[in-house]
């Protein structure tokens, strides 16, 4: 990462494809994570997402991206962020300190309309997606696919 | 270093298309999108629409629905946008612009092509 | 489409002046703003980014704030090259917009 603090910060409330709304519960002292339709007027649960700057030759990154990308990472309560598990292909809450381990670390994707996608850091070609209404870690095979909905999500600060 | 260069002037009748090119070099390709913004004369800039070389999915300006076509080569780096059923307004410099950051439009446009003139005239 | 609303539209200024120009979104664009400079017969060149990034090789004296749906561009102390066109641009969501334009002219 090239500068250890967020060129920006903002609250944003995510959503998938379809519209149904990521929500956080804590559950046995620990965070769970949901995809559901949010009754009307319900509440939206809202995600810091923080931006960071990355910067590096293609030939050090072995992702073959030479310049600079957009990582960000996402936190939908103080002290917890969202991480991959990249052996289970889950999406987990976990509780760290900065500075946040590569898991909680994820190129923003946004060549779709007005969708975000999620890579994770540490695995190029695997992206956050909706699975069985959790998220997941799904490998994402061709170019064609990265268009899959089930990895692509909405974000709003309303 | 990392360019693109785009085709020549062109000089088109009403009602005729018009396809221009855009090659890039100096980096990965399918890793940016590729915008097509517009300037008519002594005017402000217009964002015409993206194409993700990637996949080749595209986005329009609603404006440009129905009449432009961007279209990628992955083979030789280079996009291509075509506008058809051409009238008197659309007489203005076309570039090609590269996002700052790969897979993303939100760090701005950084890398573009010079332009290339498009005079529609009868 | 979000409204990018640039004022002044032109701004009469001298070498060392401090020259502002601001540009008012039309609905929220999170910090998704970025400032270009236009030269005649040139293609523009990315400044600012982010709403307050400075892009690698521009000047220091350029700089960028604002959030939401207010942002500024200023130039601490205007230097001969730096008389040209400046435009914001959202890039928030498409489609993608820019302001019509602040055309920085020799007092």
């Known amino acids: 990462i090239t500068g250890i603090s967020p060129i920006t910060e903002y609250l944003a409330s995510l959503s998938t494809y379809n519209d149904q709304s990521i929500t956080f519960a804590l559950e046995d002292e620990s965070y769970e994570i949901y995809v559901e339709d949010l009754k009307k007027d319900e509440k939206k649960d809202k995600v810091l997402l923080s931006y960071y700057e990355s910067q590096h030759p293609s030939n050090e990154s072995g992702d073959g991206v030479d310049g600079k990308m957009l990582m960000v990472t996402l936190s939908p309560t103080k002290d917890f962020w969202l991480h991959a598990n990249n052996k289970e292909h889950s999406v987990e809450l976990h509780k760290c300190e900065k500075p946040l381990p590569d898991q909680a670390f994820f190129v923003l994707h946004n060549m779709h309309s007005n969708c975000v996608s999620f890579e994770c850091k540490t695995d190029p070609g695997v992206f956050i997606g909706v699975k069985d209404n959790h998220l997941a870690l799904i490998k994402v095979d061709s170019s064609e696919n990265l268009c899959t909905e089930n990895i692509l999500f909405k974000l709003s600060e309303t | 270093q990392v360019q693109l260069v785009q085709s020549g002037a062109e000089v088109k009748k009403p009602g005729a298309s018009v396809k221009v090119s855009c090659k890039a070099s100096g980096y990965t390709f399918i890793s940016y999108g590729m915008h097509w913004v517009r300037q008519a004369p002594g005017q402000g800039l217009e964002w015409m629409g993206e194409?993700?070389?990637?996949?080749?999915?595209?986005s329009y300006a609603q404006k440009f629905q129905g009449r432009v076509t961007m279209t990628r080569d992955t083979s030789t780096s280079t996009v291509y946008m075509e506008l058809s059923s051409l009238r008197s307004e659309d007489t203005a410099v076309y570039y090609c612009a590269r996002p700052s950051a790969a897979y993303s439009h939100y760090l701005g446009l950084d890398i573009w092509g010079r332009g290339t003139l498009v005079t529609v005239s009868s | 489409d979000i409204q990018m609303t640039q004022s002044p539209s032109s701004v009469s200024a001298s070498v060392g002046d401090r020259v502002t120009i601001t540009c008012r979104a039309s609905?929220?664009?999170?910090?998704?703003l970025a400032w270009y400079q236009q030269k005649p017969g040139k293609a523009p060149k990315l400044l600012i980014y982010?709403?307050?990034s400075l892009q690698s090789g521009v000047p220091s004296r350029f700089s960028g704030s604002g959030s939401g749906t207010d942002f500024t561009l200023t130039i601490s102390s205007l230097q001969p090259e730096d008389f040209a066109t400046y435009y914001c641009q959202q890039a928030n969501v498409f489609p993608l917009t820019f302001g019509g334009g602040t055309k920085v002219e020799i007092k």
């Open positions: 982010a709403g307050s």
């Open positions: 194409i993700n070389p990637h996949g080749g999915s595209t």
């Open positions: 609905q929220g664009i999170s910090p998704w």
